[in-house]
């Protein structure tokens, strides 16, 4: 099942995904697409990296982190209701059927009538059922809904969502990431 992420209309949506390169600078191609991950590649590609850099990019879709260190999280700017749906983060590991695929469900809610603060900076967590992540845009609050039972591959996407908490460091240190090689 997909991990669910939420944002309001007009906010930025943040979809976390990362892997651990086998060696510094030894990157693997990554693609982000709209729609569930197909058997190969990404459908409706919105952003793509190769072994060195971003090589395909579309308006409003940005790599959010230090992708050269394996943080290939995606930011979608100024979302609309049409941005709702499943997004695929595909880590294209060389070899037959070696790819790591993550399907992330983005739910866009209508904007609240009451004005929100300009930037939410505090990490708060009523763990384990509800998480609110630090904002990355104007008037942005992103909330994960009730979390399903999480396996290690899902943790690899969640860990980056929690990157500002001690838990994030613990997850990384414990190896709860996709390691290449």
């Amino acid at each position: 099942s997909e991990v669910e992420y939420r944002a309001e209309v007009g906010q930025n949506a943040y979809l976390p995904c990362f892997y651990t390169p086998a060696a510094p600078g030894n990157l693997v191609p990554v693609c982000w697409g709209k729609g569930a991950c197909p058997v190969f590649e990404c459908g409706n590609v919105v952003l793509r990296t190769d072994e060195r850099d971003v090589n395909y990019w579309t308006s409003r879709y940005w790599l959010n982190g230090d992708f050269r260190k394996g943080d290939v999280s995606l930011t979608i700017e100024n979302v609309t209701l049409a941005d709702s749906g499943i997004y695929c983060c595909r880590i294209q590991i060389p070899g037959i059927m070696n790819d790591e695929k993550f399907n992330l469900k983005l739910v866009i809610k209508p904007a609240k009538v009451t004005p929100a603060p300009t930037r939410q900076r505090d990490f708060t967590a009523a763990f384990p059922r509800m998480l609110t992540t630090r904002g990355h845009g104007p008037a942005e609050t992103q909330t994960l809904g009730s979390l399903p039972d999480i396996n290690l591959t899902q943790i690899s996407t969640l860990a980056n969502e929690l990157r500002d908490s001690r838990l994030a460091n613990d997850l990384r240190d414990s190896g709860a990431t996709i390691r290449i090689g």
Epitope: D53, V54, R60
Partner: antibody, heavy 122, light 108 residues
């Protein structure tokens, strides 16, 4: 050819205001995060502020937060820095710099302007 | 907050190899970028993402990054390499760009 040209610097009294501009050319301006970086006389580089490609998100160094405002006009390919409540310690050469492709924050500064000098003194 | 530490100065004879370090807590987990700045001029990117070289930068410039130290290496140093060198990272915890204090490279 990528070009960044700053303007608007000058002498201003403490507590005063100044607006810097950076005219960009040679690339698709809205596709890149942009930053302002300053350098006080004889000192090192200090990042001041950054703005995402759409202008939707802005970031500030603690030393200028609440006093400086970064903005951009993508239709004019121009980056701005509104500086209010200026202090003597804001005296510096201010550079505008372009971030890297496809990244929200810019990550590094690929191209720099030649800078404009801001002097805050009574 | 995160701090980047550079030696204030490094001296090297022409033709020799200069190494400029940039220290930071687990800096190997971050991408490090290096800039060269000559007097009266704007900075120029010489290394990005730890070890990549922009077009136009000589192969004599190289970079590495692991553990708590990133290093800019300039081999076969020339008089024209004399400049200030700055390391830089993006600190995602604060959403701030950080520079090291700078290192003045003197060619003897």
């Amino acid at each position: 050819e990528v070009q960044l040209l700053e303007s608007g610097g000058g002498l201003v009294q403490p507590g005063g205001s100044l607006r810097l501009s950076c005219a960009a050319s040679g690339f698709t301006f809205s596709s890149y995060a942009m930053s302002w970086v300053r350098q006080a006389p004889g000192k090192g580089l200090e990042w001041v502020s950054a703005i995402s490609g759409s202008g939707g998100s802005t970031y500030y160094a603690d030393s200028v937060k609440g006093r400086f405002t970064i903005s951009r006009d993508n239709s004019k390919n121009t980056l701005y820095l509104q500086m209010n409540s200026l202090r003597a310690e804001d005296t510096a050469v201010y550079y505008c710099a372009r971030g890297s492709y496809g990244t929200y924050y810019g990550n590094y500064f690929e191209y720099w302007g030649q800078g404009t000098l801001v002097t805050v003194s009574s | 907050s995160y701090v980047l530490t550079q030696p204030p100065s490094v001296s090297v004879a022409p033709g020799k190899t200069a190494r400029i370090t940039c220290g930071g807590d687990n800096i190997g987990g971050k991408s490090v970028h290096w800039y060269q700045q000559k007097p009266g001029q704007a900075p120029v990117l010489v290394i990005y993402y730890d070890s990549d070289r922009p077009s136009g930068i000589p192969e004599r410039f190289s970079g590495s990054n692991s553990g708590n130290t990133a290093t800019l290496t300039i081999s076969r140093v020339e008089a024209g390499d004399e400049a200030d060198y700055y390391c830089q990272v993006l600190d995602r915890r604060s959403d701030h760009f950080l520079f090291g204090g700078g290192t003045k490279l003197t060619v003897l």
